[in-house]
């Protein structure tokens, strides 16, 4: 058993049928010695008397808010949550496996640049009685500071019969140098509590590996005289690290017909313009990627050919 | 990425082309190592990230773009002195910092070159003959060092009398390649920045 926060405790259980569970001793936070009784949640049934209460915690029915009273007055509370260990592996019931980029990916994180700011998000099908708390650091043995905000519900989607809820959090490394070569990964830890179930999820990454630039901005077409060709031009996104000559991007320009089946013409360039043939009803899209370290491509920025 | 490679303009900063070749070569070598050593811990998540140049050179600090010198987090300064002549500087009036930067890059390359050559000698003794260093990568390191053209003492190649532990050598190879790839990215960024300056 360990303390999650004041008056909230997590009981770790080896979770299998007929498991013996864990013996827990609760102590009433009071100078009083006599006439103390204990109850669980809203029930008025007295579970025991005295300054301490010993309970055998086996299942969720044994978890909850234990309260000690004296003469009708509440003295203190202890909330017990359960953390299930199933065959040596902590349970992951609360969050959905996003399966990207690999199986058992519960937290996904992205950064728009090298400033040390990043966003993480996760999915769940649970809509109520759900709380999250996020902590982060650079490295784990001698951790350096990363400050995270509160997790917020950022999107709701319908997936078949189920509703899916996306939560996200923004974090900022306290003293980040965009040019630094990372040797210690960022660690992100999310505590999730659903009703009386506690779970924790972690992710470890280097900022360089989670970079995904914003799409190029100001995408424009300039027709070339007496030709079906057009000059496409664009700019670096505002959110990308500067100077751009140091933090350079490379670009992919794509001409896509109306039908998804039509062959796509693609050109790769390090410049912020390209000459392409504009077909009728086609659209031109451009996306960006760090020129030197191949992390994710940005989303496409698009303009119609017409 | 398999992209068409543009040939640099003749007037271009001479080291840019070499640094691009270096990044391409080390990236290919790392990919090859990951595939060949699939049963070894060779991925970024599995290895310890060690920098053999730590406390010996200060490339990131010495080569910091001017725009980032205002960022206190980047000014983790270390006192290091370097020799300040080099052919990459030939056509430009360059500051002492730029000379320091290129000299630091040269020292990095020299250190990695020695490590890689020592390691290759060990890998050639492996009866499994599982993996060797790409000669192209070693040649590209050499070319960039020649382009930088700094004079510095020759570092003797390390020789070891004891029987090599091939498992450890292959893990060390992965660690070295990961670190060298990160340094090659920095070198490429620096060359691109200097070319634009």
């Amino acid at each position: 058993i360990w303390e999650l926060k004041k008056d909230v405790y997590v009981v770790e259980l080896d979770w299998y049928p007929d498991a013996p569970g864990e013996m827990v001793v609760l102590t009433c936070d009071t100078p009083e010695e006599d006439g103390i009784t204990w109850t669980l949640d809203q029930s008025s049934e007295v579970l025991g008397s005295g300054k301490t209460l010993t309970i055998q915690v086996k299942e969720f029915g044994d978890a909850g808010q234990y309260t000690c009273h004296k003469g009708g007055e509440v003295l203190s509370h202890s909330l017990l949550l359960l953390h299930k260990k199933e065959d040596g592996i902590w349970s992951t019931d609360i969050l959905k496996d996003q399966k990207e980029p690999k199986n058992k990916t519960f937290l996904r994180c992205e950064a728009k640049n090298y400033s040390g700011r990043f966003t993480c998000w996760w999915l769940t099908t649970i809509s109520t009685d759900l709380t999250f708390s996020v902590k982060s650091s650079r490295g784990s043995s001698d951790p350096q500071g990363v400050t995270c905000g509160a997790a917020t519900l950022s999107a709701e989607r319908v997936r078949g019969d189920n509703k899916e809820y996306e939560y996200s959090v923004e974090c900022q490394e306290d003293s980040a140098c965009p040019a630094a070569e990372e040797s210690l990964p960022i660690e992100v830890m999310v505590d999730a509590v659903h009703k009386l179930k506690y779970e924790n999820y972690t992710s470890s990454f280097f900022i360089r590996d989670i970079i995904k630039p914003d799409p190029p901005k100001n995408l424009q077409l300039k027709p070339l005289k007496n030709s079906r060709q057009v000059e496409v031009s664009w700019e670096y996104p505002d959110t990308w690290s500067t100077p751009h000559s140091y933090f350079s991007l490379t670009f992919c320009v794509q001409v896509q017909g109306k039908s998804k089946r039509e062959k796509k013409d693609r050109v790769f360039t390090d410049k912020t313009s390209a000459t392409v043939i504009c077909r009728k009803n086609a659209s031109i899209s451009v996306r960006a990627q760090d020129r030197y370290y191949s992390s994710s491509w940005s989303e496409w920025a698009s303009v119609p050919c017409s | 990425r398999n992209l068409p490679v543009a040939t640099p303009d003749p007037g271009m900063f001479p080291c840019l082309h070499h640094s691009q070749n270096l990044l391409r070569a080390v990236s290919n070598m790392l990919q090859k190592a990951r595939q060949t050593l699939e049963f070894y811990p060779c991925t970024s998540e599995e290895i310890d990230h060690e920098d053999i140049t730590k406390d010996k050179t200060s490339t990131v600090e010495a080569c910091l773009p001017l725009e980032l010198t205002k960022n206190e987090s980047c000014l983790n300064s270390r006192e290091t002195s370097f020799i300040t002549n080099g052919s990459c500087l030939a056509s430009r009036k360059t500051s002492f910092m730029m000379a320091l930067c290129l000299s630091s890059i040269y020292e990095d390359l020299k250190m990695y070159q020695v490590e890689f050559k020592t390691m290759n000698a060990k890998l050639l003794m492996d009866p499994k003959r599982q993996i060797f260093l790409d000669q192209n990568m070693l040649a590209v390191i050499d070319e960039l060092m020649q382009a930088l053209n700094f004079n510095s003492e020759t570092v003797p190649q390390k020789s070891s009398l004891e029987e090599p532990d091939f498992y450890k050598t292959k893990i060390k190879l992965c660690i070295l390649l990961h670190a060298f790839r990160i340094r090659a990215v920095t070198i490429d960024r620096v060359m691109s920045y200097l070319n634009a300056s």
Partner: antibody
Framework: QVQLVQSGGGVVQPGRSLRLSCAAS????????MHWVRQAPGKGLEWVAF????????YYADSVKGRFTISRDNSKNTLYLQMKSLRAEDTAVYYC????????WGQGTMVTVSS | SYVLTQPPSVSGTPGQRVTISCSGG????????VKWYQQLPGTAPKLLIY???QRPSGVPDRFSGSKSGTSASLAITGVQAEDEADYYC????????????FGTGTKVTVL
């Protein structure tokens, strides 16, 4: 006393279907994940499928994906394995078992796929 | 599709120490705990060892398990006639948990 009692095995022709059941007692069935494991005659153990305690997630071995469906009825304390498009190589003793560091196995039920 | 490799058979005389190896990789044994089962002819498997080296109550202390790196082993110290059975190791694969990964199985013969 934890008990898992299996039923539903038998002889079936290739391409046909069969449903196996596993009735649980002696524990809170709705709190635990459950597996199906099979063993072909004279061969080793092969994992078939898993279902979460609440039925929300199901996992299958590649060899049965798209043909077998694991399900549970927590109100009846019963686990099921619906097997469709059966093949000769599905011939095996099928076991249900609880998920956890200490596990309990059913007695097994024989499924023979033969024409 | 067995990812954990065991010797097909091992044998010993009563009282001898018999060991069975179970060889895996970084993604299974290297990352997860190992279980060992005993299966007597015509019966369901019985758990002998969980969590690499833990014995459930009721399992004789002549059975012991250990794990090192990407391999595990089961030792029967002072093998007895009633130990003649098939033995299976089991773990999980990092990317496909909760799918069970079983060993190929080992037939123990008491001479």
């Amino acid at each position: 006393q934890v008990q898992l009692v299996q039923s539903g095995g038998g002889v079936v022709q290739p391409g046909r279907s069969l449903r196996l059941s596993c009735a649980a007692s002696g524990f809170t069935f709705s709190s635990y994940g459950m597996h199906w494991v099979r063993q072909a005659p004279g061969k080793g153990l092969e994992w078939v499928a898993f279902i979460r305690y609440d039925g929300s997630n199901k996992y299958y071995a590649d060899s049965v994906k798209g043909r077998f469906t694991i399900s549970r009825d927590n109100s009846k304390n019963t686990l099921y394995l619906q097997m469709k498009s059966l093949r000769a190589e599905d011939t095996a003793v099928y076991y249900c078992k609880t998920h956890g560091s200490h596990d309990n196995w059913g007695q097994g039920t024989m499924v023979t796929v033969s024409s | 599709s067995y990812v954990l490799t065991q010797p097909p058979s091992v044998s010993g005389t009563p009282g001898q120490r018999v060991t069975i190896s179970c060889s895996g990789g970084r993604s299974n044994i290297g990352s997860n705990t190992v279980k060992w089962y005993q299966q007597l002819p015509g019966t369901a498997p019985k758990l002998l060892i969980y969590g690499n080296d833990q014995r459930p109550s009721g399992v004789p202390d002549r059975f012991s398990g250990s794990k090192s790196g990407t391999s595990a082993s089961l030792a029967i110290t002072g093998v007895q006639a009633e130990d003649e059975a098939d033995y299976y190791c089991q773990s999980y694969d990092r990317g496909s948990h909760p799918a069970l990964t079983f060993g190929t199985g080992t037939k123990v013969t008491v001479l």
